[in-house]
Interface confidence: low
């Protein structure tokens, strides 16, 4: 039975040209996290593999940085980065947990950031 839950940064906004941290946290389960995939719609951004470490998709390597933790930092944001992002936790023995984050990249300099998220 899957007892875990994913906490995410939720809906966030950031300024064009700036950077943002996408963060998820899996709680309420003792399952082992074997891999975390970060995806944007149907594109794979990055993998954090317990065995093999971080790998950033080649098409994003100039604008995506691993961390902090299992999170992902997006840099040099453009309006085209607006959209849904997913953290997909592959765990054993539970299976797969998915968290959703909606990012809005604003032209304006008055982007309102969501509440700061911290990993417990």
């Amino acid at each position: 039975m899957m007892t875990g839950t994913i906490e995410t940064t939720g809906n966030i906004s950031a300024e064009k040209g700036g950077s943002i941290i996408l963060q998820c946290h899996l709680s309420s389960t003792t399952a082992q996290v074997t891999q975390v995939n970060w995806e944007q719609q149907d594109q794979l951004l990055a993998i954090c593999n317990a065995d093999l470490g971080w790998h950033i998709s080649p098409s994003f390597k100039d604008r995506v940085a691993p961390g902090p933790g299992l999170g992902l930092t997006l840099q040099s944001l453009t309006v085209n980065d607006t959209g849904e992002y997913f953290c997909i936790y592959h765990t054993y023995p539970d299976g797969t947990y998915t968290g959703r984050i909606f990012l809005e990249v604003l032209e304006s300099s008055v982007a309102e950031h969501g509440a700061r998220f911290q990993i417990p």
């Epitope: 082992q32 074997t34 993998i47 593999n49 317990a50 065995d51 093999l52 790998h55 998709s57 080649p58 054993y92």
Partner: antibody, heavy 116, light 110 residues
């Protein structure tokens, strides 16, 4: 003594699934990376994929969607679906392959022919 | 993707010759490189790992050097049993990879 032995059918029909097993002895899969490699007749080595100590897998770009590597206590399995004549090759398993001390040792290899 | 390019693809040499094979990675792989020897009908045999460390039981006439993108396998004095095909292999990255091996270099008798 560390040993690897590939086994499986030597003949597979086109469009079917190729299934091979690598049986290991002398070391533990729980602390080892394991790779599958193939070599078409008269050609070079082609990497198929790797399975990590905790069961995580990475596959070659050309094999994604067709290949599955899994493991049990002392065996590593390779499944390659929808095979064609181009998949005819000698298939090897080897210990290591990712930031380790090279792939060593290798199994002796098993020839798989895809033909109707 | 990381591409591994070996050169030459083949070479002819005589017993006693010094032979050099090069391998170039399309991006920095630090020292995560291995070299293998393969004889016809046999499985590849590990010669060198971490770019320059000699594998157990490998004769000292084999040596490896390089880091980053450019690597070299040298056979200081070619012996009759060294006529074979040699492959380099990057161990740096296994995600989004087409092939970890170079295309091979066949060392033939002149």
């Amino acid at each position: 003594q560390v040993q690897l032995q590939e086994s499986g059918p030597g003949l597979v029909k086109p469009s079917e699934t190729l299934s091979l097993t690598c049986t290991v002895s002398g070391f533990s899969l729980s602390s080892s990376y394991m790779s599958w490699i193939r070599q078409p007749p008269g050609k070079g080595l082609e990497w198929i994929g790797i399975i990590g100590s905790n069961g995580n897998t990475y596959y070659a770009n050309w094999a994604k969607g067709r290949v599955t590597i899994s493991k049990s206590s002392n065996q590593v399995s390779l499944k390659l679906s929808s095979v064609t004549a181009a998949d005819t090759a000698v298939y090897y398993c080897a210990r290591g392959g990712y930031r380790t001390s090279g792939m060593d040792p290798w199994g002796q290899g098993t020839l798989v022919t895809v033909s109707s | 993707d990381i591409q591994m390019t070996q050169s030459p693809s083949s070479l002819s040499a005589s017993v006693g010759d010094r032979v050099t094979i090069t391998c170039q990675a399309s991006q920095n792989i630090y020292s995560d490189l291995a070299w293998y020897q393969q004889k016809p009908g046999k499985a590849p045999k590990l010669l060198i790992y971490r770019a320059s460390t000699l594998a157990s039981g490998v004769p000292s006439r084999f040596s490896g050097s390089g880091s980053g993108t450019d690597f070299t396998l040298t056979i200081s004095s070619l012996q009759p049993e060294d006529f074979a095909t040699y492959y380099c292999q990057q161990e740096h990255l296994v995600a989004w990879i087409y092939n970890v091996f170079g295309q091979g270099t066949k060392v033939e008798i002149k």
